[in-house]
Interface confidence: low
């Protein structure tokens, strides 16, 4: 190889060892039979050399630095050449460095031809191995503007006082042009301006100077976004830190065309603007930091550009002003991540503050809109607490558990509406009365409605799930001892049409000791399946539940258990079941941890089934499934 650098070219070439690989045989640069591991060639020098191995690219890297002095003479503006040409260089990983020094009053602009640049964060690398590292200068301090790959949106970077651009090319890359030009501009009066151009839908992730380290103190950095007028842009902060300010406040400022309040000033912790039409600027302003404990200011953010959706022009009013202790969250439904670009899906408050999820609280009227390509990507979860603190005031009081119509009118599917029902301990209990009798969901008779009620204890230490219930069954009411949560969960968009079938009333009633009592009024010729709470996990220790089963005068009920033994093994106490005729009070008692479960039995009158658990050994839980079937009494039961 021969490298000859013209006099006055201000170019230095350095060949040095890269990160050594685990290769057995070392490699050297050979000049006049001398073996060396580093070679420096300066302007005006001509050197002939070879390598002592077949694959020098595994050992060495080459750096070509050109110093451009715009302080003492005219600046060579225009397209930047790769000098020496890559064809004259050995095939090593190579880095071309241009170090431009200029006066503070001169602005320098790097213009990148297509493909434009894409900024990458720490630990990221470029797919083709070609990276652009750009830094600026504040007095004598070097400031890293960022590291960039090809195929992005960054078209221009403006700086003043000097710029250092390093283009890294892997040894195998055929590129033979720099891909950028330098132009002079008037002073930009800030650290830098980065221009990002969107031709269509897409996203860009950008970072403050020096990221992930601290942004220079009291500096200003601007990003200019060029967005077609028919598209919408949204900004979201992925990561930020605030430093400790002594004077002034760290902030971001937006210049949004058409806004009457330019510049719009936001704190970094604020929700950032969304749904912006056309071009806009974003500036990051630092502060004077505390000398003793400066901390660091840093910011990583994403700009998402997409088509406006029909919904983005519609405003929905969610009136929660008359509600208490209620929160409504609109959020993305869980999906498998796809690798291709997926347009963002945002919900916007007052059309401007957009984010992927939004929580609205009671006591106010909220105006929301959507910036989303497909609203089925979102769902709603609502929580409402109904609590009674004074048992004398609440007793016999009733509340309707109904989804407010304002919520049903939103164009987003309701997933869960949870009511947390709280009562004073050992003072009151609760009764749930549905508008339509309920069916308990079982494997044998699953619910196939568009929604169900999930009833569970709301006492933190108690793991008790009563079950999932849907309209169209035989359960007339459910009484529970203490705090519960009732969740209306929807399973199909058709819930909107079936919403009229929902309706549950809760009443506060005098306290009773049993964990739950189900009142069952079976319909003729239908088999009612019932199962103990906490199915699959077992009825909790020392818990008692009952079923009050009505048998009409002209009917007989057949009670059937679906296994021979309960399977429970008690560590302490006894598990038992009582079947009691309500008219005669006659009862049968079965020891569930010892006896065989009863064979199918026939009941001519209403009866109770009560199941009480012991403290079972782990793995030997109490789970019972039984059914009740009515048949006319005229049938010969023998």
């Amino acid at each position: 190889f021969e490298i000859a650098l013209p006099r006055e070219s201000n170019i230095t070439v350095l060949i040095k060892l890269g990160t050594p690989t685990l290769l057995a045989k070392p490699c050297y640069i050979v000049i006049s039979k001398r073996h060396i591991t580093m070679l420096s060639i300066k302007s005006g020098e001509r050197i002939v050399f070879t390598f002592s191995c077949q694959s020098p690219e595994n050992h060495f890297v080459i750096e070509i630095q050109k110093n451009i002095d715009c302080m003492s003479g005219p600046c060579p503006f225009g397209e930047v050449q790769l000098q020496p040409s890559t064809s004259l260089l050995p095939t090593l990983n190579r880095t071309f460095i241009w170090d431009v020094k200029a006066h503070k009053s001169i602005g320098l602009e790097l213009q990148f031809s297509i493909p434009r640049l894409r900024q990458i964060g720490p630990g990221e690398s470029c797919p083709d191995g070609v990276t652009h590292s750009i830094s600026g200068r504040i007095d004598a301090t070097v400031v890293r503007i960022g590291t960039f790959c090809s195929n992005g949106t960054v078209s221009r970077i403006k700086m003043q006082e000097g710029v250092k651009m390093a283009l890294h090319l892997p040894w195998f890359h055929p590129r033979n042009v720099s891909g950028f030009s330098i132009a002079n501009r008037s002073s930009i009066k800030r650290l830098c301006i980065i221009e990002s151009v969107f031709e269509g839908e897409g996203s860009a992730t950008l970072m403050s100077a020096n990221y992930p380290e601290g942004f220079p103190e009291d500096e200003l950095m601007t990003w200019q976004f060029v967005v077609p007028a028919h598209l919408r842009a949204s900004v979201s902060f992925l990561n930020f830190n605030l430093s400790n300010c002594e004077r002034k406040e760290e902030r971001v400022e937006y210049y949004i065309p058409g806004s009457t309040t330019n510049p719009e000033v936001f704190k970094l912790e604020d929700k950032q603007p969304g749904n912006m039409a056309g071009n806009f600027n974003l500036s990051l302003q630092g502060c004077d930091q505390d000398a003793q404990s400066p901390g660091i200011l840093r910011l990583q953010f994403q700009v998402l550009v997409q088509h406006p959706q029909n919904e983005s022009n519609k405003i929905y009013v969610v009136d929660l002003s008359n509600e208490r202790a209620m929160s409504l969250t609109i959020e993305p439904r869980p999906v498998k991540q796809s690798r291709k670009f997926v347009p963002g899906c945002f919900v916007c408050l007052e059309s401007r503050t957009c984010s992927s999820n939004l929580t609205l609280t009671s006591g106010s009227k909220h105006k929301i809109s959507f910036l989303c390509d497909d609203l089925t990507r979102l769902w709603m979860n609502v929580e409402k607490t109904i609590s009674c603190t004074d048992h004398r005031y609440c007793q016999r009081k009733s509340y309707s558990l109904q989804v407010p119509s304002d919520i049903l009118h939103l164009p987003v599917e309701l997933h869960d509406f949870s009511w947390k029902l709280l009562v004073p301990k050992d003072r009151l209990s609760l009764v749930l009365v549905p508008a339509q009798k309920l069916q308990q969901h079982t494997h044998e008779k699953p619910c196939n409605t568009s929604f169900s009620y999930l009833v569970a204890s709301a006492i933190p230490s108690q793991d008790l799930y009563f079950g999932s219930f849907c309209p169209g069954g035989s359960i007339k009411q459910i009484q529970v001892k203490q705090n519960i949560s009732v969740t209306l969960r929807t399973f199909a968009p058709s819930f909107q049409q079936e919403a009229s079938r929902q309706g549950l009333t809760v009443s506060f009633i005098p306290y009773f000791k049993e964990e739950g009592v189900f009142t069952v009024t079976p319909d003729t010729k239908s088999k009612v399946y019932l199962r103990t709470p906490n199915w699959d996990r077992g009825l909790p220790s020392l818990t008692s539940v009952s079923w009050n089963i009505s048998v009409p005068r002209d009917q007989v009920a057949c009670l059937t258990f679906f296994k021979e033994r309960s399977g429970v093994v008690c560590q302490t106490g006894r598990a038992f079941m009582i079947i009691q005729e309500q008219r005669t009070r006659a009862e049968e008692i079965f020891s569930l941890d010892e006896d065989v479960l009863p064979k199918p039995s026939f009941h001519h009158h209403s009866f109770w089934v009560n199941i009480s658990n012991c403290s079972p050994t782990s793995g030997k839980q109490l789970d019972l499934l039984f059914s009740v079937t009515l048949t006319p009494r005229t049938v010969d039961l023998t």
Partner: antibody
Framework: EVQLVESGGGLVQPGGSLRLSCAAS????????MHWVRQAPGKGLEWVAS????????SYADSVKGRFTISADTSKNTAYLQMNSLRAEDTAVYYC?????????WGQGTLVTVSS | DIQMTQSPSSLSASVGDRVTITCRAS??????VAWYQQKPGKAPKLLIY???SLYSGVPSRFSGSRSGTDFTLTISSLQPEDFATYYC??????????FGQGTKVEIK
């Protein structure tokens, strides 16, 4: 296979120095944050220092700032913790860990005892 | 600095129990919270990262969730090998990284 092996621990007097090493294999430390985390006997985990060698980025817990120095030799694929002016409260098992989203690989730890 | 307040500091449970450990961040840390398991004399092991992502090779009985600045680690059905100390950690800020005080899960 990713592996981290710490060494250099031992008994040292208050005011003394030690240098811990963390030899990494199965990955390139340049592409990851490397951390030192310590655990005093019977106590919880305490972050000590971090390095991101690609950008020469280092950071330290307040309790060790000015006394400990984290460094990395990417050619040896090894991270180091130079500990000076050691105090009794620095007695702990010192773990080295790498992270991306979180600390996914840890070494087995090396015990540092500071006692007179 | 961000504090991670972990509770409870210890708990007794039986095999098969559902166990919940919570961590509250003193300020927003987005979803940058990880959970680790540590057994006596051993290095910690990563269970959950980014608040709810299960690390490869970790049994699915472990799960993580986030509600604002509250983070929860749940073991749906405690197994004999799960008796250990659990730590949460925020990685939102590279400096300083902070761990919770730890929760020791003991056999009842």
């Amino acid at each position: 296979e990713v592996q981290l092996v710490e060494s250099g621990g031992g008994l040292v007097q208050p005011g003394g120095s030690l240098r811990l090493s963390c030899a990494a294999s199965g990955f390139n430390i340049s592409y990851y944050y490397m951390h030192w985390v310590r655990q005093a006997p019977g106590k919880g985990l305490e972050w000590v220092a971090s390095i991101y060698s690609s950008s020469s980025y280092t950071s330290y817990a307040d309790s060790v700032k000015g006394r400990f120095t984290i460094s990395a030799d990417t050619s040896k694929n090894t991270a180091y913790l130079q500990m000076n002016s050691l105090r009794a409260e620095d007695t702990a098992v010192y773990y080295c860990a790498r992270s991306y989203y979180a600390m996914d690989y840890w070494g087995q730890g090396t015990l540092v005892t500071v006692s007179s | 600095d961000i504090q991670m307040t972990q509770s409870p500091s210890s708990l007794s449970a039986s095999v098969g129990d559902r166990v919940t450990i919570t961590c509250r961040a003193s300020q927003s840390v987005s979803s940058a919270v990880a959970w680790y398991q540590q057994k006596p004399g051993k290095a910690p092991k990563l269970l959950i990262y980014s608040a709810s992502s299960l690390y490869s090779g970790v049994p699915s009985r472990f799960s993580g969730s986030r509600s604002g600045t509250d983070f929860t680690l749940t073991i749906s059905s405690l197994q004999p090998e799960d008796f250990a100390t659990y730590y949460c950690q925020q990685s939102y800020y590279v400096y300083p990284i902070t761990f919770g005080q730890g929760t020791k899960v003991e056999i009842k």
